[in-house]
């Protein structure tokens, strides 16, 4: 996250951090906890490493170097990686990753409310993006987990940022005019979060951007209302009944 | 399964025009930024030329800009480089080449990962 | 223009011999945008790795790519009969795209 500030604990209490160990452990990306077994990410999180094994899920956490070999960890059953994504295009960045074990839900480690399918109505005005990445482009992995207020753009704004590139109504940007706050390298996977209503959904998933914070390159994020009918059909057909944190 | 086929190459001479094809089949040719690439004999690679999924965006080496067209037809699932004022030096095997563009590290990647056989263009009197 | 200079020229070697290229950027290049070709005679160049240290689909394993900013690598750990042509990196990260002079991998 870049021009962000240190979060507080159980304040982002569904945000997870995907990490590898191969011959290292090292944090990958983020990921959000939307139910017991079930913990919604990106789909590019997983190119080049779609192997469970690898994978150990952190939740509850704050700051990654209080990681030590016996801090618990939640291990993969299944990676389910929308079935439009393609390695070469880059839409559809989104994939469910369900738990070997449900998780206990607690003041430090419980889901977030999912958006109503196709909200197009709401304005949401009071947004922000978590995680443990760069804090600049050239940067690393920090400890503390950040957290940045950034407002939405129109898909309009944000596709005369990205002339190169399609800007689908299945993506929601988000950044200031004048750049300095944004997420960046790290962050991928994780939440945009927003708070109306009294209530905090899950607005957008962590995708890309041209950079990290610069001027008038807004961050690309997933749009995770336009994705509802696939989560639900994934997370009901593999659980028999899901258990989604939905608002309605 | 992916496939480019290049065509509309063979001699001219110098001051003369050509126009390249590419044939684009197996995949969904309107998503793709499309790029020319070219190889003189005996040389390295050298970038021509891309356009943008709708055709909106061209960029060009300095080496062609004013000389070289690049266009597309998404209806047809072809790639155009249409070639002007040709000199000597333009000889070579011209490639169309799919652009790649994934995500990793909340980054776009952008790479080329299906290319055509190739066509030769030779200028010469 | 972003100049892409890769050496040696050439490197004369035998089958299960290890290869290591290197390429250099006269600027910052970010990883994603860093790509290596391989190019045999008479045939069109094939991608074997993106983003600096990606695999393409297809692959062998022996092939790996490493670097940031303006020194990449391509290893080829093991050197198989198929292996020997011309390698090429590329950058995407400006335009215009550059590629390198190539390294051209000859049996010894």
């Known amino acids: 996250i870049v021009g962000g500030t240190n979060s507080s604990w159980g304040e982002w209490p569904w945000q997870v951090s995907l990490q590898v160990k191969l011959t290292a452990q090292r944090h990958l990306c983020g990921g959000s906890l939307i139910g017991h077994q079930w913990v919604l990410t990106a789909a590019h999180c997983f190119d080049g490493l779609p192997l469970q094994d690898v994978w150990r899920i952190y939740s509850g956490i704050l700051n990654l170097s209080d990681i030590t070999k016996d801090t618990p960890f939640s291990q993969i059953k299944e990676i389910i990686i929308h079935q439009n994504y393609k390695v070469s295009e880059g839409n559809h960045d989104i994939a469910l990753i369900k738990l070997q074990a449900p998780l206990n839900y607690t003041e430090f480690q419980k889901p977030i409310c999912l958006p109503s399918k196709g909200d197009t109505s709401t304005i949401y005005t009071n947004c922000w993006v978590t995680g443990w990445g760069f804090s600049k482009e050239k940067g690393e992995i920090q400890n503390i987990l950040q957290k940045v207020n950034i407002p939405l753009v129109t898909n309009e704004e944000c596709q005369k940022r990205y002339q190169d590139y399609k800007i689908t109504q299945r993506m929601v940007c988000a950044g200031y005019k004048e750049g300095g706050k944004d997420a960046c390298k790290g962050d991928s996977g994780g939440p945009l979060v927003c708070k109306h209503n009294g209530m905090w959904r899950l607005v957008g998933i962590t995708s890309w951007g041209e950079g990290c914070a610069r001027r008038e390159q807004p961050g690309v994020y997933t749009k995770v209302a336009e994705y509802m009918d696939w989560i639900l059909e994934k997370t009901q057909s593999s659980d028999g009944k899901a258990q989604m944190q939905s608002p309605a | 399964e992916v496939q480019l086929l290049e065509s509309g190459g063979g001699l001219v001479q110098p001051g003369g025009s050509l126009r390249l094809s590419c044939a684009a089949s197996?995949?969904?040719?309107?998503?793709?930024?499309m790029t020319w690439v070219r190889q003189a004999p005996g040389k390295g690679l050298e970038w021509v030329s891309y356009i943008s999924p709708s055709g909106g965006h061209t960029i060009y080496a300095d080496s062609v800009k004013g000389r070289f067209t690049i266009s597309r037809d998404n209806s047809k699932n072809t790639l155009y480089l249409q070639m002007n004022s040709l000199r000597a030096e333009d000889t070579a095997v011209y490639y169309c080449?799919?652009?790649?563009?994934?995500?990793?590290?909340?980054?776009?990647?952008?790479?080329?990962?299906?290319w055509g056989q190739g066509t030769l263009v030779t200028v010469s009197s | 223009d972003i100049q892409m200079t890769q050496s040696p020229g050439t490197l004369s070697l035998s089958p299960g011999e290890r290869a290591t290229l290197s390429c250099r950027t006269s600027q910052f290049v970010n990883s994603n945008y860093l790509a290596w070709y391989q190019q045999t005679p008479g045939q069109a160049p094939r991608l074997l790795i993106y983003g600096a240290s990606s695999r393409a689909t297809g692959i062998p394993d022996r092939f790996s790519g490493t670097g940031y900013g303006t020194d990449f690598t391509l290893t080829i750990s093991r050197l198989e009969p198929e292996d020997y042509g011309t390698y090429y990196c590329q950058q995407s990260s400006r335009t215009p795209w550059t590629f390198g002079q190539g390294t051209r991998v000859e049996i010894k």
């Open positions: 197996g995949f969904t040719f309107s998503h793709y930024l």
């Open positions: 080449a799919r652009v790649a563009r994934g995500i990793a590290a909340r980054s776009r990647t952008v790479y080329f990962d299906h």
